[in-house]
Structure formats: structure tokens, C-alpha cells
């Protein structure tokens, strides 16, 4: 039934970039400026997204595809299709309601976005701290005591990564 109906429906012949104009006997008309249709058989064209303010145009709108936005320098995208722009912070900081704040002692953030995370707790694996953590970098754990014993093999597989946890300094 669907196939029969589509054969009889003149709008199904309208390609992407056009719409089926009911005001003109269902003739396929090109999408007007600043609008698009990404699929065939459309009865209307969609309005192009406009990248304004903190948004900037990553890809211009065409008759068959919407514009794509990203964020101006100092901001990064959030949400599907970059629906929001959020302020960048420096490494070693996180964004709060009051702006960018330094990571608390025992936490780090090695990116310009996201939250401060706790340092890895080396002692959970029976390891000691090889390199201390900073606001910008996680702790680095040394090898386990078993790796250092006289009978240790020369090559050990990498230890599995664990969830970061507090590391006493």
C-alpha cells in the first residue's frame, strides 16, 4: 500500500533541497534562502541554524544540509550537535557557578573542560608514589614491591587502570 501511494504521490519525486509546494500544484520548488531539506518528499524546508554570539559557523548551511556550529576560542561545545557553548578553564581548574576555580589539593584536571578528579591512590595496589600529583596531573604510581624483588622477571604486563582515588602524599 505504501509503495502504491508513493507512486501516486507527486511529492515523493521532490529531491532533497526542494519542497513540495501545495500552492503551486505540488510542484517541486527549491528551498528559499536560509532554509534546507535534507531528504526527498518534504512538504516544507527547515530554517537553517544560525551560529551567533559565542557560536561560530563550522559548516555553512546549504539547500540540502543544515549549518553546523562550534564555539569561539575560549569555549567548548556541549550537547548533541554543539547545542551549548561552555567556558574553558585552564588545566588545574574546573568550572563552577562562580567561574573557574583551582582544583582542591588531592585532585587534578589535565584538560580545559570537565571537573577535577581525585589523584590515583597508589596504595590500593600496594604501590608507592613515583611522581607526586599536581593540580594539572595525576599521581604516577611506581611498580609494585613484587616487581622489585630479586626474582622479578624483566618484563611485566601493564597493571590494569583503576578508578582514580585519593593518594596520601
Amino acid at each position: 500500500f505504501e509503495r502504491t501511494r508513493s507512486l501516486q504521490d507527486p511529492c515523493s519525486n521532490c529531491p532533497a533541497g526542494t519542497f513540495c509546494d501545495n500552492n503551486r500544484n505540488q510542484i517541486c520548488s527549491p528551498c528559499p534562502p536560509n532554509s534546507f531539506s535534507s531528504a526527498g518528499g518534504q512538504r516544507t524546508c527547515d530554517i537553517c541554524r544560525q551560529c551567533k554570539g559565542v557560536f561560530r559557523t563550522r559548516k555553512e548551511c546549504s539547500s540540502t544540509s543544515n549549518a553546523e556550529c562550534d564555539c569561539t576560542p575560549g569555549f567548548h561545545c556541549l550537547g548533541a550537535g554543539c547545542s551549548m557553548c561552555e567556558q574553558d578553564c585552564k588545566q588545574g581548574q574546573e568550572l563552577t557557578k562562580k567561574g573557574c576555580k583551582d582544583c582542591c589539593f588531592g585532585t587534578f584536571n589535565d584538560q580545559k573542560r570537565g571537573i577535577c578528579r581525585p589523584w590515583t591512590n597508589c596504595s590500593l595496589d600496594g604501590k608507592s608514589v613515583l611522581v607526586n600529583g599536581t593540580k594539572e596531573r595525576d599521581v604516577v604510581c611506581g611498580p609494585s614491591p613484587a616487581d622489585l624483588s630479586p626474582g622479578a622477571s624483566s618484563v611485566t604486563p601493564p597493571a590494569p587502570a583503576r578508578e582514580p582515588g585519593h593518594s596520601p602524599q
Partner: nanobody
Framework: AVQLVESGGGLVQPGGSVRLSCAAS????????VAWYRQAPGKPRELVAV???????RYADSVKGRFTISRDNAKNTVYLQMNSLKPEDTAVYYC?????????WGQGTQVTVSS
């Protein structure tokens, strides 16, 4: 995963110098801290020197002023320059690459200090 290969060991006279290299596969090597450990026969491995991803260094008291650790991230290599060598520096030297709680060893290179 990053793999580490040491080279540069050998026989050297007391008071001499040698430079060990720890070459890594993998483009994320620059984010790893790298340490040199050494192991003499029948003894546990001991930390010799460590360099963080930012280049901060730390040394065992027994090698301070004689050994220098450095890194060339463009070459994915960490070096251990060993000067004024003593017979007690004789050991197998191992490279250890670490990031958070993950760690990888090299296979080791023998350094023998003897006249």
C-alpha cells in the same frame, strides 16, 4: 600499549661514562613518567632516577651529581647519562614507564663497571 626498549649498556672502566637510552613505541609516551631502576645480582631493583611528563627530575642519593636523566619527546626517548662510574654501579638497568596506576617495563640492559 607503550613498549620500552633499553640500549647503551656495556663494559666501562671505573671513572668512565655511558649513556643509556629508553626508546618507546607509541605517540602518548610524552604523557608518561619514566624511571630508571637497576638490579644487581641477588638484590632488589632500586630506583635510580625519574623524570615526569613535564620534565621534573628526582635522583637516588647514591647517584646525585653523577647521573642525569633527560627526555626527548620528539624521539620518544629517555636518556640516562652516567658519569664517574663506580664498580657498585654494576647492574642491569631497567626502564619503567608509568602513567597513573599503569606501568610498563623494558627488558633491561647490562652495565658492568670494571677495570
Amino acid at each position: 600499549a607503550v613498549q620500552l626498549v633499553e640500549s647503551g649498556g656495556g663494559l666501562v672502566q671505573p671513572g668512565g661514562s655511558v649513556r643509556l637510552s629508553c626508546a618507546a613505541s607509541g605517540s602518548i609516551f610524552s604523557s608518561y613518567a619514566v624511571a630508571w631502576y637497576r638490579q644487581a645480582p641477588g638484590k632488589p631493583r632500586e630506583l635510580v632516577a625519574v623524570i615526569s611528563s613535564e620534565g621534573t627530575t628526582r635522583y637516588a642519593d647514591s647517584v646525585k651529581g653523577r647521573f642525569t636523566i633527560s627526555r626527548d619527546n620528539a624521539k620518544n626517548t629517555v636518556y640516562l647519562q652516567m658519569n664517574s662510574l663506580k664498580p657498585e654501579d654494576t647492574a642491569v638497568y631497567y626502564c619503567f614507564g608509568g602513567r597513573s596506576s599503569m606501568g610498563t617495563w623494558g627488558q633491561g640492559t647490562q652495565v658492568t663497571v670494571s677495570s
